[in-house]
Amino acid sequence: MAVTACQGLGFVVSLIGIAGIIAATCMDQWSTQDLYNNPVTAVFNYQGLWRSCVRESSGFTECRGYFTLLGLPAMLQAVRALMIVGIVLGAIGLLVSIFALKCIRIGSMEDSAKANMTLTSGIMFIVSGLCAIAGVSVFANMLVTNFWMSTANMYTGMGGMVQTVQTRYTFGAALFVGWVAGGLTLIGGVMMCIACRGLAPEETNYKAVSYHASGHSVAYKPGGFKASTGFGSNTKNKKIYDGGARTEDEVQSYPSKHDYV
């Protein structure tokens, strides 16, 4: 039951996270004009990954897309790429995780297949979340650098009669949405990976205890498992259940080479 809950919660958290990453990517307020001493402004500028906007105090808002590709800063292109990669990985992860959900039955899908799919989607969510966090952080760093550069410019070269009002930009709402969404996707991915451990079938090689009976050696497996000669070499990839009534969730598993596809 706990594994199902962990998997379900991981899916929901990742879903919210990816929705947030998509929202952040589409938002126009990645950077907003710094109002410093003046909370009321006649002209308010803000910028997104795809367009820049101006809102006048009259209420009129005008947005212009960045119609050039080569003329854009490399950092902006990098942030765009990171966010898109995050969305694509997240979307694929969501698709995979839907089929991996324990509550959804698809034909006669093996538990091991569901475990592998859960792990795959979990890793995808983790990478997706990291991409979003990286993208937002790169943009934030770019803003901080530009902010202090423009601040320096504001206080230099003012010897002349004419002053130029330097527009400084600070963190926009999209950055916070992106950070939170990336974090949620990351958490969801970790939860999926944890759930995967509980989903995978029993594959542990149990150490056999030898009892020397008269005449020939027989190795007995503890806990009601079948006895076999040797030390479990033929039990690899076989489900050997004891008579106890155990739910699938309670069957503890450990990662094997087959879990990482």
Partner: antibody
Framework: EVQLVQSGAEVKKPGASVKVSCKAS????????MHWVRQAPGQRLEWMGM????????NYNEKFKGRVTITRDTSASTAYMELSSLRSEDTAVYYC???????????WGQGTTVTVSS | DIVLTQSPDSLAVSLGERATISCKSS????????????LTWYQQKPGQPPKLLIY???TRESGVPDRFSGSGSGTDFTLTISSLQAEDVAVYYC?????????FGQGTKLEIK
């Protein structure tokens, strides 16, 4: 047709207060910022402050802060400008004006003459 | 506050001639976000409130005759009346629409020569 109709001329003594009204019609009153601008004889136009009729949020020129209060009555589609502690230099024509695209004033009231004299 | 200085203070032009009024700003009125200049021109006739002519430095308000045109960028702006008509006799003001408090030029009185 958009119209801004202001209250009549006022004569006040120094230290007194004056409240000028501006009734809007022909448009959605709550959708546009209403500004107040004054013009003293032979002087340039001087921006005093503004109010958003929908939210009631205001912004004033520092020069008039503490002396000017802009309010509105949405049910009557009317904006008000009250100037206190009147001085002789406050003698001017007071205008209300609607803000439009480009942060420009497209419609103005006819003006209210306020005379401050002892 | 932004200071706007108009020149000349008064101007006399013959009917049908070109009239040019200048407006200089103490700060740039160009907004980098949309590359628009936040300068507005008004016409005021005696006993009347100002009338909007030009906004964004060069965009003519609807209903304004096309003989009125605005130009300039940054700190230097010009209002041009290509062919002066008798009804154009008035005082013309420029306005900073970029930052609060909004400020106005001292005005240019246009007369017929």
């Amino acid at each position: 047709e958009v119209q801004l109709v202001q209250s009549g001329a006022e004569v006040k003594k120094p230290g007194a207060s004056v409240k000028v009204s501006c009734k809007a019609s022909g448009y959605t009153f709550t959708s546009y910022w209403m500004h107040w601008v004054r013009q003293a004889p032979g002087q340039r136009l001087e921006w005093m402050g503004m109010i958003h009729p929908n939210s009631g949020s205001t912004n004033y020129n520092e020069k008039f802060k503490g002396r000017v209060t802009i309010t509105r009555d949405t049910s009557a589609s009317t904006a008000y400008m009250e100037l206190s502690s009147l001085r002789s230099e406050d003698t001017a024509v007071y205008y209300c004006a609607r803000l439009k695209t480009g942060n420009s004033f497209d419609y103005w009231g006819q003006g209210t003459t306020v005379t401050v004299s002892s | 506050d932004i200071v706007l200085t108009q020149s000349p203070d008064s101007l006399a032009v013959s009917l049908g001639e070109r009239a040019t009024i200048s407006c200089k700003s103490s700060q740039s009125l160009l907004n980098s976000g949309n590359q628009k200049n936040y300068l507005t021109w008004y016409q005021q006739k005696p006993g009347q409130p100002p009338k909007l002519l030009i906004y964004w430095a060069s965009t003519r308000e609807s209903g304004v005759p096309d003989r009125f045109s605005g130009s300039g960028s940054g700190t230097d702006f010009t209002l041009t009346i290509s062919s002066l008509q008798a009804e154009d006799v008035a005082v013309y003001y420029c306005q900073n629409a970029y930052t609060y408090p909004f400020t106005f030029g001292q005005g240019t009185k246009l007369e017929i020569k």
